[in-house]
């Protein structure tokens, strides 16, 4: 008797990361086999979409015409042969950025620094949020999580950098996102370029184990303080 | 595109109240603050408060707390400023604007509300 | 409150000429947390709703023509339209974010000699 069904293999285009209101279509990819395509988002209904092959039967396509908050999550897809169902894909994640106001992200104390000196890299958002992304241009993954340990929302999120390198200059942006769901991000924030000056060609730098603050100094404005826990953000690198 | 579109223009007595809407449209809604903002004719711009849709808080000015009570339908992505005891210079264009960080990227066309007995 | 006090009320400049309106708060508006000043501009023509031209002092909004450039810092602040246009004429206001109640200045009103 022959085995398991291939799992099917699940993409998005143009990306797994959408903009509120652009159009996404989810692909999967079977056998030649396949008489249908079933595709399936964690905590909904399922299945979310059924779908006939497209010639040569080997894959079907989702359309979302304009995403919104509904449509962000993560998804499987599993196609029917004539011996039943197929191993479940490896689950694509459909992010969707532009939920909320963009941060602002700063560099302190300047976006000029010295190779060997330190920098911070200050991500503010205007609603208290609980995980903050750093991401680098042209970096394949997000360069920085910081999640809280507890849930306390903050207004903002810190990314010690020490000591630089010219690995960490750059152009960088920052997103902010709420517990309740990690796949909504808000619109990123205005890039900023961080030079490094007098760099020399050091090792790649390990990052740093500080952790960030939950409310900056008492004139920070319109920025509560004292009114967060000082839980502190849990650093992932990724 | 982002718009905020307001409800029309209001005649009302001393005394009375008005309740001015504005409904968006071209971006997610929940995540936004909405600030209402106020013009007298031919005067200068006063902030009047805000309203977070995702989670109903409000934060009003002074000046006008007591008076001003603003609401919001998620279903419609609509919402709502409601001023009340009008008085002669509650006269103005009353604007609905989205909140970027504590300023205002879009702003809604402007709703007249005259006070006049 | 913050009070924001703009100067001149009204300028006329003749086309092509340069443009300066400024702004000046009643306490500084630099945050210490992250060094940015909480200031934007806005553009309002007759009969239409403001339009955000500049925020955090300096950085230009998405759409604004460069001729348009915020500077300044702390307490006292300036908008400069380069090389003005017959568009331009509006009536221009800063506002302060860096405390509630959010204010803005009285306004100045930008006219063609």
């Known amino acids: 008797q022959a085995g398991p069904l291939p799992k099917p293999t699940l993409w998005a285009e143009p990306g797994s990361v959408i903009s509120w209101g652009n159009s996404v279509t989810i692909w999967c990819q079977g056998t030649l086999e396949a008489r249908e395509y079933r595709l399936d988002k964690e905590e909904s209904p399922a299945p979310w979409d059924r779908q006939n092959p497209l010639e040569p039967k080997n894959k079907a396509r989702f359309s979302i015409p304009s995403m919104t908050e509904d449509y962000a999550g993560r998804y499987r897809c599993y196609y029917r042969s004539p011996v039943g169902w197929s191993q479940p894909s490896d689950p694509l994640e459909l992010v969707m950025t532009g939920a909320y106001s963009k941060p602002t992200l700063s560099a302190l104390p300047s976006p000029l620094v010295t190779s060997g000196k330190s920098v911070t890299l200050l991500c503010q958002s205007r609603s208290p949020m609980d995980t903050f992304l750093l991401i680098k241009e042209r970096a394949a993954h997000p360069l920085l999580h910081l999640r809280s340990e507890h849930g306390a929302q903050q207004h903002q999120a810190e990314f010690p950098m020490s000591p630089v390198t010219s690995v960490h200059g750059g152009t960088y942006r920052c997103f902010s996102s709420h517990g309740f769901s990690h796949y909504l991000l808000s619109h990123p924030s205005d890039p900023l370029e961080l030079i490094v000056s007098g760099s020399l060609e050091d090792p790649r730098p390990s990052p740093t184990r500080s952790v960030s603050t939950a409310a900056g100094p008492e004139d920070q404005p319109l920025m509560p303080t004292g009114s967060v826990p000082h839980s502190g953000l849990r650093r992932h690198w990724e | 595109q982002v718009q905020l579109v307001q409800s029309g223009a209001e005649v009302k007595k001393p005394g009375a109240s008005v309740k001015v809407s504005c409904k968006a449209s071209?971006?997610?809604?929940?995540?936004?603050?909405i600030d209402w903002v106020k013009q007298p004719p031919g005067k200068g711009l006063e902030w009047i408060g805000y309203?977070?849709?995702?989670?109903?808080?409000?934060s009003y000015n002074q000046k006008f707390k007591g008076r001003v009570t603003m609401t919001v339908d998620k279903s419609t992505s609509t919402v709502y400023m409601e001023l009340s005891s009008l008085r002669s210079e509650d006269t103005a264009v009353y604007y609905c604007?989205?909140?970027?960080?504590?300023?205002?990227?879009?702003w809604g066309q402007g709703t007249t509300v005259t006070v006049s007995s | 409150d913050i009070v924001m006090t703009q100067s001149p009320d009204s300028l006329a400049v003749s086309l092509g000429e340069r443009a300066t309106i400024n702004c000046k708060s009643s306490?500084?508006?630099?945050?210490?947390?992250?060094?940015?000043?909480?200031l934007a501009w806005y553009q309002q023509k007759p009969g239409q709703a403001p339009r955000l031209l500049i925020y955090?002092?300096?950085t230009r909004e998405s759409g604004v023509p460069d001729r348009f450039a915020g500077s300044g810092s702390g307490t006292d602040f300036t908008l400069t339209i380069s090389s003005l246009q017959a568009e331009d004429v509006a009536v221009y206001y800063c506002?302060?974010?860096?405390?509630?109640?959010?204010?803005f200045g009285q306004g100045t009103k930008l006219e063609i000699k």
């Open positions: 306490q500084s508006l630099l945050s210490s947390s992250n060094q940015k000043n909480y």
């Open positions: 309203i977070f849709p995702s989670s109903g808080e409000t």
């Open positions: 071209g971006y997610s809604f929940s995540g936004f603050y």
């Open positions: 604007a989205r909140q970027a960080f504590y300023y205002f990227d879009y």
């Open positions: 506002q302060q974010y860096y405390s509630y109640p959010l204010t």
């Open positions: 955090w002092a300096s």
